[in-house]
């Protein structure tokens, strides 16, 4: 499919001008290659009319130009003094006319309306309001006032001062007679339809002395604004419908076959399933405007979108609307990254988030999409030290591996963590990507004690058991804080005995804290990584208390200091449901009751072989 995009249809009137914008992927080659505008012949060729290399056909001499905007990835063709002869099929493109890097454009130039003398022209957008003013003389002040519409050869009564309203206008028309001082009446038509366009006649009086005034009403269908976005990127539609619809339900819909427009999202709570997890509708201040953000763009998202306002929350005749034509460029600069990441209850996930590598200094963010109301995405963590309170100790945003990717690690997973998350930066807003976390059956691979108490001034050793599947990975311990996880020295204690059916390649790696101080209290993570790519992690909260008796503490998984109501598994490991808690010192009081939805036998699942867009919690 050609990545060139422009308007499918351009309509104008004789004598007027048009400006046609064509979009292309702004690669280095594309920015500098030839741009052209050509007319398609009956036999399939395409005759160049104007190009960026200076050529201008004699047909366009003195009335057209082509300007390239390489920084935007667009070029613009302006054509003036249009005639009906300019109607036809054209292409805007890059390179050689026959190469296929082009977009088809239909140009329709119509004859201007033949208007009677003294005709007032009203040009109004679809769905809006028009006021037709009708002057009259004093002698007709007391006489009947009326508005007719010319249908074919005959005038048809639309409204009059005796109370008649044509059924086609019921509920959306009124006739106002100004105060005695002004010799004027006006007809106000709301929620204008395309069928309202045409020639009108207002009249005061019915005899030969009546006053008449011609009016021509043109109802404009909104020209779609062209929007060109990258596959996997995001788009924002800004919809400004005016203060008169500030309190009316708003919607965004996508046109399907014919005149149907399927609701994508509306303020009444409707949202199309295909947009679950990747759309926000944001009401704006005062004026009834709103914006809709869609992330994780797919090729099937391309098409014509309309936003509007109607009490039903969907497109109806007479809704004021705005239109966009969205083109999704499949030659995307946004790299593929997994759209689904799987983890097990009690385990962890490491999510890779792409960003524009030119913006390495930008602030990185991760938020949780919530579908309630119109959708919102509260921030969970950023690269400047913000961590949402409920996530302290189990969530970290790391700048690694860098060069266009950052990492978010979330551990102590529960079923409540399943959902959609957005990766964002404060640089190029189009780089918002969506990832879904799924909680699947299985057990965490890394095994650590549930909670640990250290004694001031003593030495503490905390074990982390790594199964043999991680034999080739780097193993580490780190201390969590709100800006990351600071690496700590650890000791390899040899093979672990914590795993059934696991050979000498399993490992027990311990963290040792010498001469414990109050500053050592907090969350510690053990984990695996390969270079700058992070895999699974497990978290332990270390509380610090006053010395009771001398000696050092060596914490094992099957330590007998389990709380009385903790469940000890057959294999001798304490199983703790790692709830995110606001005061980790309450951790010992937490009842470790297994959530049957979250805990299951069997090992972790990894990448689904059926999808290159999914990743397991520890794979990359």
């Amino acid at each position: 499919k050609s990545p060139i995009f422009g308007p499918e249809e351009v309509n104008s009137v004789e004598g007027n001008s048009v400006s046609i914008t064509c979009y292309y992927p702004p690669t280095s080659v594309n920015r500098h290659t030839r741009k052209y505008w050509c007319r398609q012949g009956a036999r399939g060729g395409c005759i160049t009319l104007i190009s960026s290399e200076g050529y201008v056909s004699s047909k366009y001499a003195g009335r057209a130009n082509l300007t390239n905007f390489p920084e935007n990835g667009t070029f613009v063709v302006n054509i003036a003094q249009l005639s009906q002869d300019d109607s036809g099929r054209y292409k805007c493109g890059l390179g050689i006319n026959s190469r296929g890097l082009s977009f088809d454009v239909s140009l329709e130039v119509s004859q201007g309306p033949g208007l009677l003398n003294d005709t007032k022209v009203y040009t109004v957008d679809l769905g809006r309001t028009v006021t037709i003013n009708c002057p009259f003389k004093t002698e007709n002040a007391q006489k009947r006032k009326s508005l007719y519409k010319q249908i074919g050869l005959y005038p048809v009564l639309v409204i009059d001062s005796s109370g008649y309203v044509n059924p086609n206008y019921t509920g959306r028309i009124r006739l106002d007679i100004q105060g005695t001082g002004q010799l004027l009446f006006s007809v106000v038509i709301n929620q204008l339809r395309l069928s309202d366009a045409g020639q009108y006649l207002c009249q005061a009086g019915d005899d030969s002395n009546s006053n008449k005034k011609n009016a021509d009403l043109q109802v404009l269908k909104p020209e779609p604004e062209l929007v060109y976005e990258d596959l996997r990127g995001s788009v924002t539609f800004h919809c400004a419908l005016g203060p008169e619809v500030a309190n009316v339900a708003k919607f965004l819909c996508r046109q399907s076959s014919g005149e149907n427009c399927d609701v994508v999202v509306n303020t009444l709570g409707k949202r199309a399933p295909a947009f679950e997890g990747r759309i926000l509708l944001n009401p704006q201040d005062k004026d009834g405007s709103f914006s809709v953000v869609i992330t994780g763009l797919r090729k099937e998202d391309a098409g014509r979108y309309l936003c509007g306002a109607h009490s039903d929350g969907q497109l109806q005749e007479g809704s004021p609307i705005q239109a966009w034509q969205l083109f999704v460029n499949e030659e995307s600069t946004i790299p593929r990254s997994p759209t689904v990441v799987k983890g097990v209850a009690g385990g962890s996930v490491a999510v890779l988030c792409p960003y524009n590598r030119k913006e390495s200094k930008s602030i990185k963010y991760w938020c949780l999409w919530e579908g309630a109301q119109n959708g919102r995405c509260p921030l969970l963590v950023d690269s400047e030290g913000w961590v949402k309170a409920q996530y302290e100790g189990r969530l970290s945003l790391l700048e690694e591996p860098g060069n266009g990717t950052f990492t978010v690690i979330l551990n102590q997973l529960t079923s409540r963590d399943a959902g959609f998350y957005w990766c964002l930066t404060n640089g190029d807003t189009l780089w918002r990507t969506t990832v879904e976390i799924k909680i699947i059956e299985g057990e965490p691979n890394l095994k650590v004690p549930g909670n640990v108490t250290a004694v001031l001034g003593e030495t503490l050793k905390v074990p982390c058991h790594f199964p043999c599947k991680f034999s080739s990975y780097e193993k580490y311990w780190c201390k969590w804080n709100n800006t990351g996880c600071q690496a700590l020295p650890s000791q390899d204690e040899g093979p672990s005995k914590a795993f059934v059916n696991c050979d000498e390649n399993s490992r027990l790696v311990s963290l040792t804290l010498n001469l414990v101080t109050r500053a050592d209290e907090g969350w510690y993570w053990c984990g695996v990584k390969q270079g700058h790519f992070y895999g699974e992690t497990a978290a332990v909260y270390v509380a610090v208390e006053e010395r009771k008796a001398a000696g050092s503490r060596d914490v094992s998984l099957a330590k007998a200091d389990a709380a009385p109501d903790e469940k000890v598994l057959d294999s001798g490991f304490r199983e703790i449901e790692n709830k995110a808690i606001q005061d980790p010192r309450l951790f010992a009081e937490e009842k470790a009751v297994a959530d049957t939805r979250d805990q299951a036998d069997g090992s972790r699942a990894s990448v689904d072989s059926g999808s290159s867009e999914e990743q397991g919690g520890s794979s990359r």
Epitope: C377, L379, D382
Partner: nanobody
């Protein structure tokens, strides 16, 4: 639930300065100042992110007003210099504890701020 209490408003002569403070009962990712002049709609004045690295200003106050925050005290400030009679308004402090402004790019949008103070009156006489 975040409670916000503004202070620092008062009467000042044109060209003078005032410093508004807003004390919050808990931490918030984004904090903002909005104002409402008599007979007018409430409008955005300034906003600041958690770290203070991102600040936003309405065109009408750019270069004259400075927003800052002290996270240790959960307080946000609005330093207003070169005040004009048209700055006369009730100034409201607003908080977005969840940081929803980031994904929506709604830093200037009152809908994004879930918590509001009672307001403090600033009167600039000519």
């Amino acid at each position: 639930e975040v409670q916000l209490v503004e202070s620092g408003g008062g009467l000042v002569q044109a060209g003078g300065s005032l410093r508004l403070s807003c004390a919050a009962s808990g931490r918030s990712y984004a904090m903002g100042w909005f104002r409402q002049a008599p007979g007018k709609e409430r409008e955005f004045a300034a906003a600041i992110s958690w770290s203070g690295s991102r600040t936003y200003y309405a065109d009408a106050v750019k270069g004259r007003f400075t927003i800052s925050r002290d996270n240790a005290k959960n307080t946000v400030y609005l330093q207003m210099n070169s005040l004009k009679p048209e700055d006369t308004a009730v100034y409201y402090c607003a908080a977005d504890p969840d940081g929803t402004v980031v994904a929506s790019s709604g830093w200037t949008n009152s809908y994004e701020y879930g918590y509001w103070g009672q307001g403090t009156l600033v009167t600039v006489s000519s």
